[in-house]
Interface confidence: medium
Amino acid sequence: EAHKSEIAHRFKDLGEQHFKGLVLIAFSQYLQKCPYEEHIKLVQEVTDFAKTCVADENAENCDKSIHTLFGDKLCAIPKLRDNYGELADCCAKQEPERNECFLQHKDDNPNLPPFQRPEAEAMCTSFQENPTSFLGHYLHEVARRHPYFYAPELLYYAEKYNEVLTQCCTESDKAACLTPKLDAVKEKALVAAVRQRMKCSSMQRFGERAFKAWAVARMSQRFPNAEFAEITKLATDVTKINKECCHGDLLECADDRAELAKYMCENQATISSKLQACCDKPVLQKSQCLAEIEHDNIPADLPSIAADFVEDKEVCKNYAEAKDVFLGTFLYEYSRRHPDYSVSLLLRLAKKYEATLEKCCAEGDPPACYGTVLAEFQPLVEEPKNLVKTNCELYEKLGEYGFQNAVLVRYTQKAPQVSTPTLVEAARNLGRVGTKCCTLPEAQRLPCVEDYLSAILNRLCVLHEKTPVSEKVTKCCSGSLVERRPCFSALTVDETYVPKEFKAETFTFHSDICTLPDKEKQIKKQTALAELVKHKPKATEDQLKTVMGDFAQFVDKCCKAADKDNCFATEGPNLVARSKEALA
C-alpha cells in the first residue's frame, strides 16, 4: 500500500539499528572511496530526518522517495568531483536516471587495500570500547569492497561478527578463539558476495524472467512438496527482493525479505516440513536460515515426468496455449525430482526442452519428433558429472594449493591476455571448489561444484568487462549465463597468443617474501607461475613442475640463510637462468 512517507514507513518496519546499518551499506556501496567518518555523519543525518518523518509524516520533504533523499545527500558531499570524477555528473540528472547513473559507477574492483584484520588484543579493545562503531566499520569496509553485497545478509554477518567478538574477547587466548571463527565468517561472506554478484548480473543482463526461472528451479529443489503456484509465489517474491537490492533499494529489499520470511513461517504446511527450526529465530537469523535450508524430502509417489511432457498427446497444444506456464511447470517438475543437479544444469535442460518443442511442434509428426527429448538430455547431464569427477579426483590427488595451481595453468593457457592478478584471484577461488564441494556426499557434489564455479566465473566476466582483453573470454561472458561454465570448460590453449617476452625482473625475489603470511607467499608463487605460462603457453606439466619446484626450494633455502638478502641476490639470477633453460 502507498505510504505518505516512504522513509518513515521503512524506519518503523526495520527499527533504528537495522535502518542505520542499511543506510551505511547503501552509502558505502555507492561512494566506495569515502572514509567511514564521512559516511557515518550522513547516516546520522538521514536517521534524524527519518525520525522527524515518523513523528510527522507531513513534515517537509518526508514525501520524497528514498532515492531522491539519498541521492541529494550524496550529491551534497563537498569535493565530490575531486574524489569521484565523472560520478559527480550523475548529480546533474533527475531521478530515476540519477540512481541508474550511480549504479553504473559502482566499481567491482575498487582500488582499496585488502581488508586487514587487526591483532586480537587491539580488535577486542576497540570492540569493547565502542561495539557500534566497530561493527559500523565492518559494514563499511565490506560494503565498499563488495558494492553488490546482499545488504540484509551483510547485517547478518555483522551480527555473527558481534557474537564471535562478544564470546572470544573474554577468553584468555583471544587469538586462538577469534581466528578460526572469524575465518569461517569471512569465507562464508566472500562466497555470499560472489553469489549475489551473479544474481545481480543475471538481473542486469537478462532481466527478471531469467532470474525468476533460476528461482523456480532453486525453490523446487528445496521445497519439492510445495505446489507450483506456491513455488511461483516464492520465486516472484525472491525476484522482487533481489531486484531491489541489486538496484540499490536496500531498505525496501530488507523489509520485503523479512516479510517473505514471515510468510514462509506462517505457511510452513504448504511449503516444507523443514522450516520450523528457522522460524523460531529472530529476523536476520530467520531469513538467513531459510535461505540456507536443507531440501525437504521428495514425495514418494511422483509419476514419471514423461507422462505430461512427452507422452501426453496434447503437448504441443498445451505448449502453444500457455508457453510460460507449461515450461515453468516442466522446470518445476524436473527440479523437484533432481536436488542432485545444479540449477545451471536444470535451466539448460529446460532450454533444450523448449528448443525441442519449438522445432517439433512445427513439424508433421510432433510426437515422433519430441519423443526422444528426455534421452537427448543425457549428454547435457553427463558433461558436468564428468567435470565433477575429474576435478574432484585431481583435487584429492593435489590438495587445495596444488589444485589451484593446476587450474591457474589451465586458465592462463585459455586466456593469457587476462591480467595476472585477475587470473590468480580467479584460479584461487576456482580451486577452492575442491575444499568446498568435493568432500560432500555424492548427491550434493554436482550442484555445489557447478553453481559455485558459475558464480566465480561471473566475477571473472565482470572484471574482464571493465577492460576486455581476450576475445575468448568476451565470447563466453556474452552468452547465456547458464552456458558460461561449459563455455569456459571447453576453451583450449589460445593459439593466437604471442608469448610474453621473458623479463628477469618478473622472477626476481627479495627477502621480504620470507616474512609474508602463507597466503601471501602462495599468491607470490602463483603470480610467478602465471607469468611462466604467459612466457611459455605450451610448457608441459613436467616442465612447469620442475621450474616451480626449483623456485620453492630457492625461496626455502634463502629464507633459512643467515644472510637472506645476499642469498636472494646471488641465487636469484641462477634460478632465472635454470628456469629459462628448463623451458627452452
Epitope: 505446489e227 507450483f228 507422462a307
Partner: nanobody, 116 residues
C-alpha cells in the same frame, strides 16, 4: 490461456446427487490446487472446495460432509461429487485454478438447479 471445461450439471430434486467433472491439461491439474466455485443469482462467487496436488482437500462449511472433491490424474479430471443437494446449492459451478504467470483460469461454468 489455459482452458478448463466443466460438465455434469443439470436439474435435480432436493436430496438428490450430481457429479461434476472438470477436464484440463494434465500438467496443470497435477501441479496446482484445483477448486470448485459457485455463483448463485445476485450473489458473490464463493469457494466450494479445493484439492491440492498432494490430495489434501478443503471444503466450505455449507457443503462439508455432503460434497467430495477428488482428482483422477490418468483422466486429467477433477470431480465434485454432490450428495444430499439442497435448493440453496442452486448456482453456476465453476472449475478454477490459478496458473502462475497468468490470470486465473476459469471454466465456462455448468448450471446446477435443485428443485424442492
Amino acid at each position: 490461456q489455459v482452458k478448463l471445461e466443466e460438465s455434469g450439471g443439470g436439474l435435480v430434486q432436493a436430496g438428490g446427487s450430481l457429479r461434476l467433472s472438470c477436464v484440463g491439461p494434465g500438467f496443470l491439474l497435477r501441479s496446482n490446487t484445483m477448486g470448485w466455485y459457485r455463483q448463485a443469482p445476485g450473489k458473490e462467487r464463493e469457494l466450494v472446495a479445493f484439492i491440492r496436488p498432494s490430495g489434501l482437500t478443503n471444503y466450505n462449511d455449507a457443503v462439508q460432509g455432503r460434497f467430495t472433491i477428488s482428482r483422477d490424474n490418468a483422466k486429467n479430471t477433477v470431480y465434485l461429487q454432490m450428495n444430499a443437494l439442497k435448493p440453496e446449492d442452486t448456482a453456476v459451478y465453476y472449475c478454477h485454478t490459478r496458473p502462475p504467470f497468468q490470470r486465473d483460469s476459469w471454466g465456462q461454468g455448468t448450471q446446477v438447479t435443485v428443485s424442492s
